[in-house]
Every structure is written in C-alpha cells, then in structure tokens.
C-alpha cells in the first residue's frame, strides 16, 4: 500500500480512527470538586470536563471562576485555512479579546513563535515517520484503555471551535502507555484536508493521509492541564490516520452526521455518548511513539505522541462530509487544518513492532539504524 515499509497490516493499513485538537485545556475538575447533592451538575453541566483546551486550543490557561480548578478547552487559539494546502505555514495572528485569549490561524502572519515562543522549539510536532529508521522497542507494550465505552447519557459536547471539531470527553476515560504511565482522556479532535487534498498532520515517508484523529490525555500525575504543559510526559496524544475505505464507519457516523448542526464557527451541539475506542484502530499493540509538542499554539513540548500503525477506514462520503461541512473564521471553510511536519532534530521515533523489517522487494537489506532508548526497561 501507500506506506511501503510497514509490516503486516500493510502500511498503516486498515481500519480505525484518531485524534486532533490537542488538549482541551483543562476542564478537569479536581477530585474534591464533587457536586452538591442539592443541585449537582446537569447533563450538560459537567464540572471541568466540558471545556478542555484543544490541542490547538491551548491558550494561556486560566481556571474558570465558576468551576474552581478547571480550564476550558476553548481557551485556545482559533484556526483558519492555510494558504498552502499541502504544507500549511507555521504562522498565526493574535488578537486581544477578553482575557488575553490568543487567536491564530493556519498560514498567516505573524509567525506562530510570536504567538507562543514554544512554537519555535526544537522538538515540535507533527513529524514525518520513517518506519525504516524507527527503533524497535519491545518494551512498548499494547496500550490499555479503560472506560472508553461511554453510555449514551450523559451527552457529550461536540464543538466547532474554528480550527477543528472537538468532542469533549467526560472524566473516567483511563489510558496507560505502560506500567506507571497513566493518563486521563480530555478531548478528541480531527485534522483534515480538502477535496482531493489530504490533511493528516503526521506523514509516513512523506505520505499524507486524508485525515487524522487525536485523543488528548493528561497524565494522572497532574490535576490540571496548565501544570502539565511543557512537562515531559505531562500530556499524551493518541493519533490515528483516517483513510478511505469501501464502507461507512458507523462509529464516526455518530459524529459526522451532526456536523451540519455546528457548521458555523463557535457553534456546538450535544451528542449521545459513544464507544470512543471504536474511533481508534483495533490494534493497540503496533504503534510509533516519540516526544513532541502540541501541533497548535501554545506548541508546548513534552507531549508523548503515539501514532497507530493501523489506520481507520471511513467511506469517501464520510471523508467529504468531514472536509466540506464546517466553517472557520472570516467566512472561510474550515479545511486543511494541519501543521507542516517539523524536523526531528535528533529525536528517535520508537516502534512497538519491527517496523524497519520490510518484506517488500524494495528493501534488499532492511537495517534498523536506531536502537531502542527503553531497551533496558
């Protein structure tokens, strides 16, 4: 397939979904914030869970006054369509509105580093993944997800935040990258392209996929997103590529069928809870992992990226709905909302499987050039 050097499931082949819009900044209520019996939070009044900053929506985070100790996902920047469809620029503009909220867009001036200096960091995301150069790391065990099958109630907030479509996740979705590496899911969002133009953020050997899903998580070592920003392993994102397949993806349809309701920037709707794990690939054992950053301002580093080897399949119609329904700022379509790939600058991407071993005729002598940093674990 398109990803020539990936083993077995054909390069990133086969069937699931992913994450975008990074954090949702932190509307995570602290454990003490249990609701009062007299008037506990309602279905849509989730304490600290509704407004997590998006991956791209990470502003200078401030707790909401009404909800002590929780941040809004919405307190993040806003996206516009990039100028160059294939390689959106790493630029943004910033306005002051209300409490110092930053506004940025894909492909504009001034450059993102002026919005957030971290965007000029050395270890940024997304990156191009070259399986042949990935370090096979047997210590990378299958991911563990618990509580991702949500009952239909309470309903979840689905929002067009101007730079992505973001689903705010309730507390209780637990994810482990390995022993002692535990996280709580905050939100998920998507990145996409435009008609005939792919829009994933990560690429594989230069190949860009139609779209990408990001599920953003906060380490259980931190109570709030702002505490975790920039701390190694403070945030973790599960990412999966979305590809075109012959059949409608029923899990994604539960979200895509509601996009018309939130076509306008800033609009939101409530959707029944669903099985969040069904939006991801079924194979949790084969993935790439590296340390990078949020892919939108504030571009905070220390984010652990886990990119599934297996892809998620959506129908052509579903991919079209994703890329052609939403509107962003200034009467522009919300399309091509991906950042250009960033240099590795010496980082080694690890693989949980021997991705460098290729059975295709192209590679005469497959070589594993990098060794696993966690080999001693």
């Amino acid at each position: 397939q398109r990803l020539p050097r990936m083993q077995e499931d054909s390069p990133l082949g086969g069937g699931s979904s992913g994450e975008d819009d990074p954090l949702g900044e932190e509307d995570l209520p602290s454990e003490e914030d249990s609701p009062r019996e007299e008037d506990p939070p309602g279905e849509e009044d989730l304490p600290g869970e509704e407004d997590l900053p998006g991956e791209e929506d990470l502003p200078e985070v401030k707790p909401k006054s009404e909800e002590e100790g929780s941040l809004k996902l919405e307190d993040l920047p806003t996206v516009e369509a990039p100028g160059d469809p294939q390689e959106p620029q790493n630029n943004a503009h910033r306005d002051k509105e209300g409490d110092d909220q930053s506004h940025w867009r894909y492909g504009g001036d001034p450059p993102w580093p002026r919005v957030s200096p971290a965007c000029a960091g050395r270890f940024q995301s997304p990156v191009d993944i070259r399986p042949q150069l990935a370090a096979f790391c047997p210590a990378l065990r299958p991911l563990e997800l618990l509580g991702f099958q949500l009952p239909p109630l309470p309903e979840l907030r689905l929002r067009n935040n101007g730079h992505s479509v973001q689903l705010t996740l309730p507390p209780g979705l637990e994810m482990a990258l390995g022993p002692g590496r535990e996280y709580r899911a905050l939100q998920l969002h998507l990145h996409w392209g435009a008609a005939g133009r792919p829009g994933s953020e990560h690429t594989v050997e230069g190949h860009r996929f139609p779209a990408e899903i990001h599920v953003v998580h906060l380490s259980t070592a931190f109570a709030r997103v702002d505490e975790a920003l920039g701390r190694p392993g403070g945030l973790a994102v599960l990412a999966a590529f979305l590809e075109e397949g012959p059949e409608e993806n029923s899990a994604y349809e539960q979200l895509l069928s509601r996009l018309e309701e939130i076509a306008e920037e800033g609009s939101e709707t409530q959707v029944p809870g669903l099985d969040i794990s069904a939006l991801l690939p079924s194979d949790f054992s084969r993935y790439f992992q590296y340390e990078g950053s949020l892919t939108t301002p504030p571009c905070a580093q220390g984010v652990i990226w886990t990119v599934f080897n297996q892809t998620v399949m959506l129908s052509a119609k579903q991919l079209h709905t994703l890329s052609d329904t939403l509107w962003g700022p200034g009467d522009s379509r919300l399309q091509l909302n991906f950042r250009a790939t960033q240099p590795l600058n010496g980082r080694v991407i690890e693989a949980s499987f021997p991705a460098g071993v290729d059975s295709s005729p192209r590679a005469a002598e497959p070589v594993q050039l990098n060794s696993c940093l966690a080999a001693g674990d």
Epitope: G147, P170, E174
Partner: antibody
Framework: QVQLVQSGGGLVQPGGSLRLSCAAS????????MSWVRQAPGKGLEWVSA????????YYADSVKGRFTISRDNSKNTLYLQMNSLRAEDTAVYYC??????????????WGQGTLVTVSS | QSVLTPPSVSGAPGQRVTISCTGS?????????VHWYQQLPGTAPKLLIY???NRPSGVPDRFSGSKSGTSASLAITGLQAEDEADYYC????????????FGGGTKLTVL
C-alpha cells in the same frame, strides 16, 4: 427545594394506555437528563427509559420499546411517560428520577415519590 | 441480572457490614462507575454513593463505597437500626440495549 412530584398512576386494563407526569422544581430542568425507573411489587429496581436535557435523544429498555414514549416539556418543567399496550407485567411503582451528572457518570440523584400503575382485568 | 448482589445481609448495631456488587467485563469491569442507593421501607430510593466512592452531602460517613476490577462494594460501619433497608448498586452495561443496570437488591437487617 429540589423536588419531583409525580401524578397519573392508576388501574388500567391490559392493552390500555396511561400517561404519567413528573413535575420538577428547584433546579434548571432543561440542564438535566431524566429517567423513569420502575419497581414491581416485592421486586428490585428496573430502568425503563431516559431522555436527554433537550429532549432530543430518548432511550428505552427492550421490555418497553415500541410501547412506551418518554417526553418532556422544558417550558413546563415536566417529564412524561406515555404507556400504551400495557401488560400485566408492567404493574409496578414508577419513579421519575433526575440524572445528576457526577464526573461524567449519570446517577439518579433526585427521585419522585413514585406512582403505582396496576395493569389488571 | 448482569450485576449481582446478595439477597440479604445482617448485622448487629455497631457492627460493620459490606454488600458486594459483582459484575463483568461489559459493565463494572469496563470502567463504568458504580452508584449505590438506599430504599427505606415504603419510600423512594435515595442516592447513597455516586462514582464508586463519593457521598452526596447529607449522607453519613459511616457509608463508603469502593470498586476493584469487576466488582464493587458498599461498607456500612457503626450499624444503626435506621440503616435497615434495601440497597441497590447501579452501573452501565455495554452489552445491553438497556444500558442502565441495577443489582437485584440486598435487604439489610439490623439484628
């Protein structure tokens, strides 16, 4: 204070219909999902149906699907359960309950006083 | 029932009793929260514990909840006569269309 007051129960013949009402007060009704839970004489609790805060989404137990309809009128702060094609096994005390959202998990935090529905010829 | 509780438990005043709620990988073991309700004779149920181990205001700290794996439990210490009631656990089950599930109920008798 926060309360749910029920009305509409009674005796009905098999195949008949009945509508239960649940008037809410003391809280922002439209912000909460609501449910009906029933309890047959001498038995345990059984969830029957639920409706989202906006009324846009409804859910039913298999045992009542196609026969019962849950609805709400947020302007009147009232929850309804329309019960058609009633059977003897529907005989129970019916409770309306508020779904308090505690950390993303719905718990039935406020209950009505219950109303007895008896299906018998 | 997809979630099981003992039909009855008993204890003397001042003692500690526990009520178990045993589920499976499609309900409690899937990460769903467990809530507990107390139903005094002739009255409507009352929320006693939410989210596995949290007490609504007004519920005495003699009541506590815990959850581990596919089961949960309710503990009552310093048993009092007024604790005599039926107790129900409730969770969710992804394998059922009726996604809200209650345990069958446990009758607590204070000796």
């Amino acid at each position: 204070q926060v309360q749910l007051v029920q009305s509409g129960g009674g005796l009905v013949q098999p195949g008949g219909s009945l509508r239960l009402s649940c008037a809410a007060s003391g809280f922002t009704f439209s912000s909460y999902a609501m449910s009906w839970v029933r309890q047959a004489p001498g038995k345990g609790l059984e969830w029957v149906s639920a409706i989202s805060g906006s009324g846009g989404s409804t859910y039913y137990a298999d045992s009542v699907k196609g026969r019962f309809t849950i609805s709400r009128d947020n302007s009147k702060n009232t929850l309804y359960l329309q019960m058609n094609s009633l059977r003897a096994e529907d005989t129970a005390v019916y409770y309306c309950a508020r779904n308090g959202n505690y950390r993303g998990s719905l718990a039935f935090d406020i209950w009505g006083q219950g109303t007895l529905v008896t299906v018998s010829s | 029932q997809s979630v099981l509780t003992p039909p009855s438990v008993s204890g003397a005043p001042g003692q500690r009793v526990t009520i178990s709620c045993t589920g499976s990988s499609s309900n409690i073991g899937a990460g769903y929260d467990v809530h507990w309700y107390q139903q005094l004779p002739g009255t409507a149920p009352k929320l006693l514990i939410y989210g596995n181990n949290n007490r609504p205001s007004g519920v005495p700290d003699r009541f506590s909840g815990s959850k581990s794996g596919t089961s949960a439990s309710l503990a009552i210490t310093g048993l009092q006569a007024e604790d005599e009631a039926d107790y129900y656990c409730q969770s969710y089950d992804s394998s059922l269309s009726a996604w809200v599930v209650f345990g069958g109920g446990t009758k607590l008798t204070v000796l």
